[in-house]
């Protein structure tokens, strides 16, 4: 080994050398915080620059760059270092337009916090584990909620679309006529009949048991979906994104009551479904491969 | 499809009575209202009555008392019936309803549908 490698090693493996990284990084992120950054912070930055370039050198000369197993480059955390070191020239030095673009590559630095704090590195380690062993999961998750998207494709397209809409138009007004005009949301609440703090008219079905318009008022499939036309079944993939929000149960109950409105009491057996199997069962199976992945990553 | 299909019209002394039908056929959800116009030679369409789903009814002020509309809606059928016929009310009357149904590949529509018409003439 040559002196300047033997140096380098010393170095790397001191326990100041990791601890002056560690105070870099959580300095750096304190500086990255701040809104509108005084002039000096400038010389501040190149500093911190010049720290992570002399860290990554240390490296380098103590390790190797990227021929042997042991190298600089074969270890994944020191691609993070890496990534941000030629950024942090790039941004400085390259004229490349939209800087502000790349300069959002310097929160990177935070994460280097990761490499350095050994606990985080397991967590981080166990993640990524958990990723791979959840690909199985992931294509099960997925073919359920395609399945049962196709379903409530089939069951509720365009059914979110039922509005109760006012008999006692003017004489020469028609429903084509009215929906070519109507603009504001005054024009709206003015011919659908609106709950009280409601922003969407009241749904309707056309079944027995769907939801029924009061008097003055008729069901008609007419307009957009409720929710400024997120909350449909009328093609896959919004279907898809229902399915991923009843699986997540986001606001599920809201869905639920739009759908039994408009469709019918009777597809309360749909959701129960849905529930049972996308948010009980898959979602612990999600958790089930998490933490498996965690204990592996900790033995 | 939805079609409207009046009937009933025809010639008719003033004074006398006529009772006009509009049906709609197609595979019908609801019919939200029904509504009889009159178009008479050179002259502009004109609403005459009208009926709602709630059996909710309005007329033109030059037919009231003398016209009056009703449906029944098992039949999706609505029906006007023309007392004290004058002269000026000979026209071609058209029925207009406002339709959700069922059309083809089972998707749900709701439009407004116009029947043909029927001839209603009053001379003496």
């Known amino acids: 080994f040559s002196p300047l490698r033997r140096i380098s090693i010393k170095i790397l493996v001191h326990s100041l050398f990791s601890m002056l990284i560690m105070c870099t990084i959580l300095t750096n992120c304190i500086f990255m915080t701040m809104n509108n950054p005084p002039d000096w912070t400038k010389n501040v930055e190149y500093t911190f620059t010049g720290i992570y370039t002399f860290e990554s050198l240390v490296k380098i000369l103590a390790r190797g760059f990227c021929v042997g197993e042991f190298t600089f480059l074969r270890d994944p955390w020191n691609w993070l270092d890496f990534v941000v070191i030629v950024f942090a020239y790039l941004t400085e030095f390259v004229n490349l337009g939209n800087v502000s673009a790349l300069r959002t590559f310097r929160v990177l630095r935070a994460l280097k916090t990761i490499s350095v704090i050994p606990g985080l590195k397991t967590i981080v380690g166990a993640l990524i584990q958990s990723v791979k062993k959840l690909s199985d999961v992931m294509i099960l998750t997925v073919f359920c909620l395609s399945v049962f998207a196709l379903i409530g494709l089939q069951l509720f397209m365009g059914n979110l679309k039922h509005k109760c809409f006012r008999n006692s138009l003017e004489n020469n007004e028609t429903l084509e006529s009215i929906m070519n005009t109507l603009e504001s949301e005054e024009d709206f609440r003015k011919y659908f009949y609106y709950l009280e703090g409601s922003k969407d008219a009241l749904l309707c079905g056309f079944s027995t048991d769907s939801g029924q318009c009061p008097e003055g008022y008729t069901c008609v499939k007419i307009g957009r979906n409720p929710d400024y036309g997120y909350t449909s079944f009328d093609t896959f993939s919004w279907a898809f994104l229902a399915l991923f929000r009843l699986m997540t149960q986001d606001y599920w109950e809201n869905l639920y009551q739009q759908t039994l409105r408009a469709a019918g009491k009777t597809y309360m057996i749909f959701f129960v479904v849905v529930i049972f199997l996308g948010s009980f069962y898959l979602i612990n199976l999600i958790l089930a491969v998490v933490a498996m992945a965690y204990e592996e990553q900790n033995q | 499809e939805v079609q409207l299909v009046e009937s009933g019209g025809g010639v008719v002394q003033p004074g006398g009575s006529l009772r006009l039908s509009c049906a709609a056929s197609g595979r019908i959800l609801r019919i939200g209202y029904m509504r009889w116009y009159r178009q008479a030679p050179g002259k502009q369409r004109e609403f005459v009555a009208r009926?709602?789903?709630?059996?909710?009814?309005g007329y033109a002020d030059s037919v009231k008392g003398r016209f009056t509309i009703s449906r029944d809606a098992a039949k999706n059928t609505v029906y006007l019936q023309m007392n004290s016929l004058r002269p000026e009310d000979t026209a071609l009357y058209y029925c207009?309803?406002?339709?959700?149904?069922?059309?083809?590949?089972?998707?749900?529509?709701?439009?407004?549908?116009w029947g043909q018409g029927t001839l209603v003439t009053v001379s003496s």
């Open positions: 207009e309803a406002l339709v959700t149904a069922s059309v083809r590949g089972g998707s749900i529509h709701s439009g407004t549908y």
């Open positions: 009926i709602t789903d709630d059996s909710a009814t």
